[in-house]
Each structure stands twice: as structure tokens, then as C-alpha cells.
């Protein structure tokens, strides 16, 4: 990824991933150089003409910055001096997805890293007891994903079984017309046992797990993105 | 402190313009979108557009189009907001803001204290 | 253009009690929502953005979620000083939208 040798810095970059709607982060970092007024970061995404974004003499220079970008785009300005040339992204589109370059001058030398950026919708999922089911069942819902993803139940004591044919799934269109909620409910469960109910899209994995006793009822769960790294 | 300092309030005749000031200090002003809201009582806020300083880029809310002119003076850290073709619908208190997130766009974080305008003849 | 719906538009509540002022966008999907503290003669205060966070030196007691088209900011053990109008700010668009506005009273 990165560049190295004479009058070359070292750049890094991060393969990460956009949920839309929200902040995203596109990660870069390089050789620290106390001198930034000696630091410029260049923000450029394969097939745009202009920039991404510009950082030079320790200000936003967005004077060759595409419209697609304008106002949505931030460095982290208090961090450029100790190597982060990461960039902060509003509002993130599924445009926004492609090939992205950070390209770092310093007082050190010059280097770019290029890193994929993938766009896409996840969220955790909730497990909850359906006591409204003739039988006892369990509800997971996730409230935004995209594209669609699979959906997939496990179980603690009886590992190995599928459970495609007692589990019923549904993706259902958000108002903006582009994401979905998913609703999984798995029918027949038994007490004194741990469920998981499995989310995943080439973006991320989700998972939700309940234990249901004749006292309590614990729930965990957790958010992974996939492909995450340098 | 991020302070922004705006102009006096101001009667003005129907069919004229007006401008206003809104003078920026405690940061740097040209790395920080200024945006412009109108207060109408009864009425709630009404967004009228924003200007980035560092390169005088704008956006308008369609209904201001022609109306609004945004424009910033690096040298002296002020955003004007000029507003034309006055009539009584225009008399309001029109306040600056900074947006917060540097060039990212972001919200109002803090305001100048409202200039008020009567357009009356 | 989002318009941002708000209500209720005046609600009146007793000391320590809590309200919830609820927007609801006309479209669009995003976390980029903000609420303000206005009083009479003053500017407004940025209490939270980004759906829910809290802006430094603002009491927990203030507090905002959503997701999609539906926000919500509530205000708990109400004081004396929450006398005020609240409104909502959409900022995720190139075109800003706020909100009409709530007035709070406390009795």
C-alpha cells in the first residue's frame, strides 16, 4: 500500500466501509512532521475530476474540490501533525463507494496509499420473545441494511442444525427506498437454551444472541465489518 | 470564545435593500461555513443559505434565490448577508451562525445575537 | 426540500416532571438532527447534535434518538430554567430545515 525509499514516506490506509446516512471515515495515515505548515494531504477518488479534499499550510484548501464533496468533507486538523490524514465523510451516499488515494506531502518526502471504500447499510439486530406466536418464538429485528443480506439462526445446544425450516424472514423497504428492515422469527424454541440470529451482507456481519431461562432473559450483540484493514 | 457579533437592528422603506454584518472572532474564520436563518414570529426559523469564507462557495434555499446575497470579507472576518426588493414579509430577525465540522457542514453551533428589521413605509 | 414536522407546539409540564418534543422528516433517511434552547432576547443554544449527542457542559438530563424519518428530544427533572422554545434542526441535506418550534412552560 504504501511507498518507501529515498525522499518517500511511508502512507497507510485502511480498507473500511460507509453506512449511509450517517459519518464516515476514511483512514490514512503517514510519517508524523512537526512542520505543518510543510503538510499537504490530497483526498482523491478514482474516476472524479478535482479533489476530494485538500489540506495545505495547515488549513481546508477546497478551491479544487468536486461539487459531489463540497461541505462534506473534514481532516482531522488537530491530528495532521502526529500522522492521521484521515478523512471525516457527511452524510455518506452509495456513490461514495470507489477507489480512493491519500496523497501526503511533508518536509520528509511524498507518498499515496489508495484504499476501497464500500457503502452499504448495517445495523445490530434485537432478539425478543414473541409471546403474540401460538408457540414459543423469537423475533430479530435489524433496522437498516443494504444490500440484502442472508439471514441465518444458530443454536448452543444443538449445533449444526439448520433452522431454515422453523424460521420465517422478511426484508422490508425503508421509507427512503433504498435500505430495508430485516425481521427474522424462529419458531419452536426451548427454554434453557442460547439462539443467534446471524446477519450478513459483503459488508458486514451482525450477530444477536439470547438466552432464555425460566427467569431471565440475557441478550448480547454485536456489529462486524468485513474486509476491514490495511 | 467563538463569537460572532452582528449589525444593529434597522427601518427600512419597502422596494429598497439592506445589509447586514455578522463579524466573526475566536476561531478561524475562513475554515468554518456561516449560515443564515430568519425568525419570524410566529412563524419559527426559515434557513436562507450558507457561505464557506475560504472560498466564498454558497448554497441557497431556492425561496431566497434573488432575494439573499451571501458574501465574506477574509481581511476583516465578516459575513454579509444583503437582502433585496424589501416588503413587509421580509421584516424578521435574521441571525448568522457558524456551522460546526470546519468544511464539513455542520450544525449551528454558535449564533450571533439576531439582527432585527422593520420594512415598513 | 425536507420539511421538518414538530410537536407538540406549546406543552406546559410541572417541575421535575419530563416532556418529549418529537420531528418528523418528510423524506430522506440520515442522523443529522439537532436541538436548540431559544429564550426570549437571547440566541439559540445548541443542546445536541447528530441525533443524540450532547454538546459539552449540557446536562444529562437533556436527551435525543431517532433513526429514519422519526427524532425525538426529551428534557428530565425539569428546572425552572427549561422555560423556553425548543425546535429541531435537519442538517444532513445541502438545504438546512428546522422545525416550527415548541414552546415549554413550567408550572
Known amino acids: 500500500f504504501g511507498i518507501s525509499g529515498k525522499h518517500f514516506i511511508t502512507v497507510t490506509t485502511f480498507t473500511s466501509a460507509g453506512n449511509i446516512g450517517e459519518d464516515g471515515t476514511l483512514s490514512c495515515t503517514f510519517e508524523p512532521d512537526i512542520k505543518l505548515n510543510g503538510i499537504v494531504i490530497q483526498w482523491l477518488k478514482e474516476g472524479i475530476k478535482g479533489l476530494v479534499h485538500e489540506f495545505k499550510e495547515g488549513k481546508d484548501d477546497l478551491s479544487q474540490q468536486h461539487e459531489m464533496f463540497r461541505g462534506r468533507t473534514a481532516v482531522f486538523a488537530d491530528q495532521v501533525v502526529v500522522g492521521n490524514a484521515s478523512l471525516r465523510l457527511k452524510n455518506v451516499q452509495l456513490t461514495d463507494a470507489g477507489t480512493y488515494t491519500c496523497y501526503i506531502r511533508t518536509s520528509k518526502g511524498k507518498g499515496n496509499a489508495n484504499l476501497e471504500y464500500k457503502t452499504g447499510a448495517f445495523s445490530m439486530p434485537e432478539i425478543n420473545v414473541d409471546y403474540n406466536a401460538s408457540s414459543e418464538s423469537l423475533r430479530c429485528e435489524a433496522p437498516r441494511w443494504f444490500p440484502q443480506p442472508t439471514v441465518a439462526w444458530a443454536s448452543q445446544v444443538d449445533q449444526g442444525a439448520n433452522f431454515s425450516e422453523v424460521s420465517n424472514t422478511s426484508f422490508e423497504l425503508n421509507s427512503e427506498n433504498v435500505t430495508m428492515k430485516v425481521v427474522s422469527v424462529l419458531y419452536n424454541v426451548t427454554i434453557n437454551n442460547t439462539y443467534s440470529c446471524m446477519i450478513e451482507n459483503d459488508i458486514a456481519k451482525a450477530t444477536g444472541d439470547i438466552k432464555v431461562t425460566d427467569s431471565e432473559v440475557k441478550r448480547r450483540s454485536q456489529l462486524q465489518l468485513l474486509n476491514s484493514g490495511p | 470564545q467563538v463569537q460572532l457579533q452582528q449589525s444593529g437592528a434597522e427601518l427600512v422603506r419597502p422596494g429598497t435593500s439592506v445589509k447586514m454584518s455578522c463579524k466573526a472572532s475566536?476561531?478561524?474564520?475562513?475554515?468554518?461555513?456561516i449560515g443564515w436563518a430568519k425568525q419570524r414570529p410566529g412563524h419559527g426559523f426559515e434557513w436562507i443559505g450558507d457561505?464557506?469564507?475560504?472560498?466564498?462557495?454558497?448554497n441557497y434555499n431556492e425561496k431566497f434565490k434573488g432575494k439573499a446575497t451571501l458574501t465574506a470579507d477574509k481581511s476583516s472576518s465578516t459575513a454579509y448577508m444583503q437582502f433585496s426588493s424589501l416588503t413587509s414579509e421580509d421584516s424578521a430577525i435574521y441571525y448568522c451562525?457558524?456551522?460546526?465540522?470546519?468544511?464539513?457542514?455542520?450544525?449551528?453551533?454558535?449564533w450571533g445575537q439576531g439582527t432585527s428589521i422593520t420594512v415598513s413605509s | 426540500d425536507i420539511q421538518m414536522t414538530q410537536s407538540p407546539s406549546s406543552l406546559s409540564a410541572s417541575l421535575g416532571g419530563k416532556v418529549t418534543i418529537t420531528c418528523k422528516a418528510s423524506?430522506?433517511?440520515?442522523?443529522?438532527v439537532a436541538w436548540y434552547q431559544h429564550k426570549p432576547g437571547q440566541c439559540p443554544r445548541l443542546l445536541i447534535h447528530?441525533?443524540?449527542t450532547l454538546q459539552p457542559g449540557i446536562p444529562a438530563r437533556f436527551s435525543g434518538s431517532g433513526s429514519g424519518r422519526d427524532y425525538s428530544f426529551s428534557i428530565s427533572n425539569l428546572e425552572p430554567e427549561d422555560s423556553a422554545t425548543y425546535f429541531c434542526?435537519?442538517?444532513?441535506?445541502?438545504?438546512?430545515?428546522f422545525g416550527g418550534g415548541t414552546k415549554l412552560e413550567i408550572k
Open positions: 423524506q430522506g433517511f440520515n442522523k443529522y
Open positions: 451562525a457558524r456551522l460546526d465540522g470546519s468544511s464539513y457542514r455542520g450544525a449551528m453551533d454558535s
Open positions: 457561505i464557506y469564507p475560504g472560498g466564498g462557495y454558497t
Open positions: 475566536g476561531y478561524t474564520f475562513t475554515s468554518y461555513w
Open positions: 447528530y441525533t443524540s
Open positions: 434542526l435537519q442538517y444532513g441535506n445541502l438545504l438546512y430545515a
